[in-house]
């Protein structure tokens, strides 16, 4: 079925995606494990006019060695201001001095590069030693070249189209990726989808793509899904400043829980299919749709918030842009960390500066507990027993108080830590949708209803079901019920939460083969997520429940066995 969603470019004020990649239009890497001299050649194409470039060389002390000498041949087509970092590297730099200007003295040996065509530049370089790597980059903003990392498929460098330079070279294009958006016809509501599609590269080695998502809207205003699709060898590390539904291929984890990998799904690998997926997830707007080469870091900045979608060209601004501090946004940037019976608030200065805010003070409710200035951030820390902390059975609460120059009254924000020792998570199985009578028995062909509870209840946190599966032992295998907070298959339904906010779902089980297992284990991973504030307070728990299985009739639909 064709999904009606006319993708159109989105203005940069609505969404912008920048990325770092090791994919180049043309390049090669040689296997050069113990090279005395590493020769690297970079062909850099810039649009007309002077460009700025940050070039970093990093030595890898693999096996305690690195090349005794490095020759970097830099061929550019127009004027470049170069910021070079090559600390402690025995570097010889060959470049055209009429085109390349250093922002500061390079502090390395330099050689004038003759104005040759590409083939002759390669010959010139090869005369000095076997070429370790060569790459052609179009309008780079920054380049990282790792020495001693060359691990190509051949022991000599041979240019290939759409080459993945692996760990040898990573770069960031100056031009952000094309972001498109559209309205999904016939879907009500304000849920927005952000779709990122990473295209396969030449190399099929395991890769982690870090996806940074910054949505600038009040946390409560957002109902969003992040769809990440890539080749099977890609896993995702998500760093988001908002809670959102996650839907990915491969595996994903969150920056705050990098070691906890969550299994993704098989997603379509076409734009149409991905739009269909967004529609299936009840999104009414595709706020951003981006296709990228195989990237290592992707940053998405969007300001859509499930409101109207604006595609380019954007209307002319009639009011001057807001250049003053936004207190609401500032308060949303305060990160709360809870550990070792202490609450820590962190506010990064870089973000504060970005918002054009000037902070004159950050304290807890008790003004004598002041934040410490740690250079790049303000850090406010207190034990649960002081600074006016309010301790309840489930939570420790306080207030962050921020004084800003542009406001006469201080800004206040409730901050919380969960008292994990006192919280207990329970799985309940019920035989009717009224969730009145608990049971520990399921009957194939009959619907079963599941509810997850946390006690005591925690009103400031949202309890969500991340995944659930039913382990039926060696004969029955595993039945996936919920993955990535979504129902798996048409015999599993996510239900409306209880009045207290407890997640609920139903499922139907059927066996096509015998013997039918007599017992099973229902296992669910749940998350407590703050309704406002940062994801670093998110808590995940896995809850188990032993179930008995009684003999079935022959109706039903979730097949397994």
């Amino acid at each position: 079925e064709t999904v009606h969603c006319d993708l159109q470019p989105v203005g940069p004020e609505r969404g912008e995606v920048t990325y770092t990649t090791s994919q180049v239009s043309k390049g090669c890497v040689a296997q050069a494990p113990n090279a005395i001299l590493e020769v690297h050649v970079l062909f850099l194409e810039f649009p007309t006019g002077p460009s700025q470039l940050e070039l970093t060389l990093q030595a890898s002390k693999q096996n305690g060695t690195w090349p005794r000498e490095v020759l970097l041949v830099l061929s550019v087509n127009s004027s470049v201001f170069l910021h070079l970092q090559a600390l402690g590297i025995p570097l010889h730099l060959a470049y055209n001095s009429s085109l390349v200007t250093f922002q500061e003295p390079p502090g390395v040996n330099t050689t004038e590069l003759p104005s040759f065509p590409k083939t002759q530049i390669l010959e010139w370089a090869a005369e000095r030693g076997p070429i370790t790597s060569a790459a052609e980059l179009n309008d780079p903003q920054s380049i990282l070249l790792r020495l001693g990392q060359a691990q190509g498929s051949l022991s000599f460098c041979m240019l290939e189209a759409s080459q993945d330079m692996g760990r040898t070279l990573e770069w960031r294009p100056r031009t952000p990726a094309l972001v498109r958006g559209c309205h999904l016809e016939g879907v009500a509501g304000h849920k927005e989808a952000h779709i990122l599609r990473v295209l396969p590269g030449h190399s099929a080695g395991p890769r982690t793509v870090t996806v940074k998502v910054e949505l600038s809207c009040a946390p409560g205003d957002l109902d969003a899904v992040l769809i990440l699709q890539g080749p099977p060898y890609v896993s995702w590390l998500i760093d988001a400043n908002h809670n959102m539904q996650i839907w990915t291929t491969g595996e994903y984890s969150f920056k705050i829980f990098p070691e906890k990998n969550i299994r993704g799904f098989k997603l379509p690998d076409t734009p149409q299919g991905l739009l269909g997926e967004a529609r299936m997830l009840n999104a009414s707007i595709v706020a951003s749709f981006v296709e990228l080469p195989l990237a290592s870091i992707v940053s998405l900045h969007a300001s859509s918030c499930g409101g109207r979608l604006q595609t380019s060209p954007a209307p002319i601004q009639t009011t001057p842009p807001k250049d003053t501090c936004s207190p609401e946004l500032l308060m949303s940037l305060i990160q709360t960390k809870c550990a070792d019976d202490a609450m820590t608030l962190v506010l990064k200065k870089e973000l504060v500066a970005h918002l054009k805010c000037t902070i004159t003070g950050l304290t807890f409710w008790d003004p004598s507990c002041e934040a410490e200035d740690r250079g790049d951030k303000f850090v406010l820390r207190s034990a649960y027993s002081s600074c006016g902390m309010q301790v309840s059975a489930s939570m420790i609460s306080n207030e962050a108080v921020v004084n800003i120059l542009s406001s006469s009254s201080p800004q206040r924000k409730k901050v919380h830590c969960l008292n994990m020792d006192s919280l207990s998570f329970q799985l309940g199985l019920y035989l009717s949708p009224h969730f009145l009578q608990a049971s520990n028995t399921i009957e194939p062909g009959q619907q079963s209803f599941v509810q997850v509870r946390v006690s005591p209840s925690v009103s400031e946190f949202l309890l969500q079901l991340d995944s659930c599966h039913l382990d039926l032992g060696p004969e029955g295998g595993t039945v996936e019920l919920i993955q990535g907070r979504a129902a798996k298959g048409n015999c599993v339904s996510l239900l409306s939460p209880s009045p207290e906010g407890d997640p609920r779902f139903s499922f139907l089980l059927h066996f096509y083969t015998v013997p039918i297992p007599k017992t099973g284990t229902l296992s669910c991973t749940v998350a407590l997520r703050p309704k406002t504030g940062s994801q670093d307070q998110e808590v995940h728990r896995t809850v188990f429940m032993r179930l008995n299985i009684i003999s079935p009739d022959l109706s039903g639909c979730t097949s397994k066995g």
């Epitope: 043309k26 090669c28 296997q31 050649v41 083939t119 390669l122 010959e123 370089a125 090869a126 005369e127 000095r128 030693g129 076997p130 070429i131 060569a134 498929s153 051949l154 022991s155 000599f156 460098c157 041979m158 240019l159 290939e160 189209a161 759409s162 030449h202």
Partner: antibody
Framework: EVQLLESGGGLVQPGGSLRLSCAAS????????MSWVRQAPGKGLEWVST????????YYADSVKGRFTISRDNSKNTLYLQMNSLRAEDTAVYYC????????????WGQGTLVTVSS | NFMLTQPHSVSESPGKTVTFSCTRS????????VQWYQQRPGSSPTTVIY?????PSGVPDRFSGSIDSSSSSASLTISGLKTEDEADYYC??????????FGGGTKLTVL
């Protein structure tokens, strides 16, 4: 000026051996991967073997694997192809070719040497 | 493994334009670069096009290369045909598994 000069071709009986040489001049020999490409009479080009600049890595076409050995002596600027267990289908003009620096193509070729395998 | 297929022969009159095709039997032609070599009778091959469409110095701009991903084929076009263009033309492709693969060659006769 880049020059490649092959030698060592001739008539050999099936099952016999032959060693081809290619003398290179006009470039830094050790910086370049080198190859042998052959052409049977009236037929097309067929890649045979490649060796990296340092001589540590070698690559062979399936048709010659286990029978032919490519090697080089960088101090003498010379490339070799040792051909054992020769067959009638190995009859061809053998060209020594330089792989372009970081390029996927052969940028310089020798004039070729004819190897005839016949009883 | 794949093969590169070229038409056996092509004939054209001087001054005209001729196009040679090279079709990859499986996989995408765009996944890597295509090269073209000219071999005049009794001579060694020389590169006329490399990396799809690049001309080595000394090769006239009458020679041009292109690829068509949809048909997985590459083309070599010679315009303003001259009698000295009479030769065999070979396409070549590098693949990580098969390494250097040549097409069977096309014989160009200038009438």
């Amino acid at each position: 000026e880049v020059q490649l000069l092959e030698s060592g071709g001739g008539l050999v009986q099936p099952g016999g051996s032959l060693r081809l040489s290619c003398a290179a001049s006009g470039f830094t020999f050790s910086s370049y991967a080198m190859s042998w490409v052959r052409q049977a009479p009236g037929k097309g080009l067929e890649w045979v073997s490649t060796i990296s600049g340092g001589g540590h890595s070698t690559y062979y076409a399936d048709s010659v694997k286990g029978r032919f050995t490519i090697s080089r002596d960088n101090s003498k600027n010379t490339l070799y192809l040792q051909m054992n267990s020769l067959r009638a289908e190995d009859t061809a003009v053998y060209y020594c070719a330089r792989i372009a620096p970081a390029g996927p193509h052969f940028d310089y070729w020798g004039q070729g040497t004819l190897v005839t395998v016949s009883s | 493994n794949f093969m590169l297929t070229q038409p056996h022969s092509v004939s054209e009159s001087p001054g005209k334009t001729v196009t040679f095709s090279c079709t990859r039997s499986s996989g995408s032609i765009a996944s890597n670069f295509v090269q073209w070599y000219q071999q005049r009778p009794g001579s060694s091959p020389t590169t006329v096009i490399y990396e799809h469409n690049q001309r080595p110095s000394g090769v006239p701009d009458r020679f041009s290369g292109s690829i068509d991903s949809s048909s997985s084929s590459a083309s070599l076009t010679i315009s303003g045909l001259k009698t000295e263009d009479e030769a065999d033309y070979y396409c070549q492709f590098y693949d990580r598994n098969s390494h250097w693969v040549f097409g069977g060659g096309t014989k160009l006769t200038v009438l």
